[in-house]
Interface confidence: medium
């Protein structure tokens, strides 16, 4: 594939990466399908720097980001390490709360209202923020 | 204080529209989710529709799908209710009511209710 | 779709009771449960939201509990105020869907 040099249309370019912000709301799993079949992935965060853009665009509510404990460790969509990466927690948190009856905990990861991070149950319709990185290869053939 | 007022409900024949209206006031109108919430007489309360705070989502029921449309004028501080192709299954009291957050965490303030009645 | 069933659908009691309606989710909702209060040809009125919080301004005689698909509103010392119809509502995703009601009548 063609290696990608600029963000799509209606994407934020931001430290060679681009961010695409949803109006709407979908489930964690349906955000990050989403995100797939877009060539990207639901946004990693790996900086306070990346933290603050990303709270900048999405004000105060609640958005989903890609990551999620729902095989059991705490992992990034893109594979980025969780144990030794940036965290911004609320206090308190993740608890993994069991009580709701879903099964497993509270599995998927938030930016809240203060931009801190929750756990929360995956099936909430929240916002959600894409990223996919520039010079990356893109799926798509190189134009003739 | 937070108040809810509708209007614009009345006597209407099967097949044809009506727009009910919701008029806020006493709390920013932009910062908040609104939903219609109906009750058929003599039955529980059915939620019909939800706006998120800036317009940008809109969730219905399958029952009004693709014949209601939901939405809001932050210049008026008024949610709207466009209710096309009416059944007699639509007859019922309207409420407005606001979302505890942006839109997606129930209601809190409801208001009076317009009734709407579809008969031919 | 999540189905909410309220039980019972009536209830006859007296001035100072302890009254329980309970809800029961198809499926389980964490805690994204409100309760509300309507009285004949009036507005619902906001009771319980988050499954146990009170709503600002509501007497602390009402109280909720519960997670997962199983609720419960307890009223601890019934009043003829309190005579009206209940419901519950989930708010887990779209769509939201109510319960079907819990009359509470003079016994």
């Known amino acids: 594939g063609s290696e990608r040099t600029c963000c799509p249309v209606n994407w934020v370019e931001h430290e060679r990466s681009c961010y695409w912000f949803s109006r709407s709301g979908k489930a964690w799993a349906d955000a990050d399908n989403y995100c797939r079949l877009e060539d990207a992935h639901l946004v990693v965060v790996t900086s306070w720097e990346e933290q603050k853009f990303v709270q900048h665009h999405i004000g105060p509510v609640n958005t989903w980001m890609g990551l999620h404990d729902q095989n059991g460790p705490w992992k990034w969509v893109d594979g980025t390490d969780y144990e030794t990466g940036f965290k911004n927690w609320r206090p308190e948190q993740p608890d993994d709360w069991y009580g709701h009856g879903l099964g497993g905990g509270e599995d998927c990861a938030h930016f809240t209202d203060d931009g801190r991070w929750n756990d929360d149950v995956c099936q909430r319709p929240y916002r959600w923020v894409c990223e996919t990185e520039l010079d990356k290869a893109s799926q798509e053939p190189p134009l003739l | 204080q937070v108040q809810l007022v509708e209007s614009g409900g009345g006597v209407v024949q099967p097949g044809r529209s009506l727009r009910l209206s919701c008029a806020a006031s006493?709390?920013?109108?932009?910062?908040?989710?609104m939903h219609w919430v109906r009750q058929a007489p003599g039955k529980g309360l059915e939620w019909v529709a939800v706006i998120w705070y800036d317009g940008s989502n809109k969730n219905y029921a399958d029952s009004v799908k693709g014949r209601f449309t939901i939405s809001r004028d932050h210049s008026k501080n008024t949610l709207y209710l466009q209710m096309n192709s009416l059944r007699a299954e639509d007859t019922a009291v309207y409420y407005c009511?606001?979302?505890?957050?942006?839109?997606?965490?129930?209601?809190?303030?409801w208001g009076q209710g317009t009734t709407v009645t579809v008969s031919s | 779709d999540i189905q909410m069933t309220q039980s019972p659908s009536s209830l006859s009691a007296s001035v100072g009771d302890r009254v329980t309606i309970t809800c029961r989710a198809s499926?389980?909702?964490?805690?994204?449960l409100a309760w509300f209060q309507q009285k004949p040809g009036k507005a619902p009125k906001s009771l319980i939201y988050?499954?146990?919080n009170l709503q600002s301004g509501v007497p602390s005689k009402f109280s909720g509990s519960g997670s997962g698909t199983d609720f419960t509103l307890t009223i601890s010392s019934l009043q003829p105020e309190d005579f009206a119809t209940y419901y519950c509502?989930?708010?887990?995703?779209?769509?939201?869907?109510f319960g079907g009601g819990t009359k509470v009548e003079i016994k």
């Open positions: 988050a499954a146990s």
């Open positions: 006493g709390f920013t109108f932009s910062s908040y989710g």
């Open positions: 509502l989930h708010y887990l995703n779209y769509p939201l869907t």
């Open positions: 499926q389980g909702i964490s805690n994204y």
């Open positions: 009511a606001r979302d505890r957050d942006v839109g997606y965490n129930g209601m809190d303030v």
